[in-house]
């Protein structure tokens, strides 16, 4: 029977800069029941606080709700593992909420075949930013990526859309059914999951000629 091994805070994520969650990996348990607690202080403070919510994020997690989240303050946190034989601490982790955003997928993905008389036909793709993201403040810049493929194909074709919320694709195989998805990320945060796929049938008379 031994003291617990060193835990590690391995991931922190925020959907929108207003709440965030961190997860840790337990070290070895030393063969004894082990209790874990996450403590933190904010920059400029010496007062230590305990995790406000161990439930919402699932096992080995700490969730910081709106009233505990500030995008202006650095959080300095560590996990303490304790059993009857002793304690061990994770390394301190410095978290700036602005850097750990992983948004929800974009919404309202709409796909349409456009066939103007005087120009090449194209696939028109449009979407909306995730609900929780407030782009009006200027604190957020969301970047978007689109992927599409014929239904039976193995390989996705990927297009980077930058900050725009609509995109045109010209080169498509006539008569094929395509799957289309979109995802987003803040400037230096994490990519969201892909949105649910939208299917579009490309007409057989869709021409790629000039």
């Amino acid at each position: 029977q031994l003291p617990p091994g060193k835990p590690e805070i391995f991931k922190c994520r925020s959907p929108n800069k207003e709440t965030f969650t961190c997860w840790w990996r337990p070290g070895t348990d030393g063969g004894l029941p082990t209790n874990y607690s996450l403590t933190y202080h904010r920059e400029g403070e010496t007062l230590m606080h305990e995790c406000p919510d161990y439930i919402t994020g699932g096992p080995n997690s700490c969730h910081f709700g709106k009233q505990y989240t500030s995008m202006w303050r650095t959080y300095i946190m560590m996990v303490n593992a304790t059993n009857q034989m002793g304690s061990s601490f994770s390394d301190e982790l410095y978290v700036d909420v602005t850097y750990i955003v992983q948004p929800d997928p974009p919404l309202e993905l709409a796909v349409e075949v456009k066939q103007p008389e005087d120009r090449k036909p194209y696939l028109w793709i449009k979407w909306s930013p995730p609900t929780l993201i407030d782009l009006k403040t200027g604190w957020f810049t969301l970047l978007y990526e689109i992927r599409l493929k014929p239904e039976k194909a193995a390989e996705w074709e990927i297009h980077f859309a930058g900050q725009q919320t609509e995109f045109k694709i010209l080169s498509l195989h006539p008569g094929q059914k395509y799957l289309v998805q979109v995802r987003c990320k803040p400037d230096h945060g994490y990519w969201s999951a892909w949105s649910p796929a939208t299917f579009i049938q490309i007409p057989s008379d869709f021409t790629m000629n000039d």
């Epitope: 602005t98 750990i100 604190w139 945060g189």
Partner: antibody, heavy 120, light 112 residues
């Protein structure tokens, strides 16, 4: 504990390219950005560029055309490549880990640096 | 690029004195996320730089409380309340808000 160690060629001929490896331990490169700096003998520090946890990069605009930063997360190594070296590229080159999880600044942990001399 | 100007270039002090180093940026260094990533580093002879202060005024772990940072916008100051022998070296301010990140030219703190 967190450690970074640079390894470089020491001497590089003018117009040749430079490759330096920064080998890290005590943290994962997927969670923390690594920056590169240099310091000519007796002079101040210059930021060269960085690679973020997600693999994206930022560069010093003055050096962007001849600089490349990459990494191998599984080997815990970050690479700096610089082309067309001249004598004024002689400096001690440092790698440093950011303070913030997934962040881009505040360099809490530094390697000891590797001295690169550009000379024929 | 943001130019960081440090004064003085050299600062002779007696042990126990207060020291003050100024750093001015050529433009605002408030990041688009609202934070100001202004940092101070100390480099002792033959060593790598060490982080003292981040985000203008926050002391890094293990940094003695005789070091304090202040300022906003474009004007920033590092103060050492009672200089000790181990504080001697070159101090650099640094902005990490706008790429390319830039250092000040350095201030050498030395014994009078």
């Amino acid at each position: 504990q967190v450690q970074l160690k640079e390894s470089g060629p020491g001497l590089v001929a003018p117009s040749q390219s430079l490759s330096i490896t920064c080998t890290v331990s005590g943290f994962s490169l997927t969670g923390f950005g690594v920056n590169w700096f240099r310091q000519p003998p007796g002079r101040g520090l210059e930021w060269l560029g960085m690679i973020w946890g997600d693999g994206s990069t930022d560069y010093n605009s003055a050096l962007k055309s001849r600089l490349s930063i990459s990494k191998d997360n599984s080997k815990s190594q970050v690479f700096l490549k610089m082309n067309s070296l001249q004598t004024d590229d002689t400096a001690r080159y440092y790698c440093a880990r950011v303070l913030y999880y997934y962040g881009g600044n505040s360099f809490a942990y530094w390697g000891q640096g590797t001295l690169v001399t550009v000379s024929a | 690029d943001v130019l960081m100007t440090q004064t003085p270039l050299s600062l002779p002090v007696s042990l126990g004195d207060q020291a003050s180093i100024s750093c001015r940026s050529s433009q605002s260094i408030v990041h688009s996320n609202g934070n100001t990533y202004l940092e101070w580093y100390l480099q002792k002879p033959g060593q790598s730089p060490k982080l003292l202060i981040y985000k203008v005024s926050s002391r890094f772990s293990g940094v003695p409380d005789r070091f304090s940072g202040s300022g906003s916008g474009t004007d920033f100051t590092l103060k050492i309340s009672r200089v000790e022998a181990e504080d001697l070296g070159v101090y650099y301010c640094f902005q990490g808000s706008h790429v390319p990140y830039t250092f000040g030219g350095g201030t050498k703190l030395e014994i009078k």
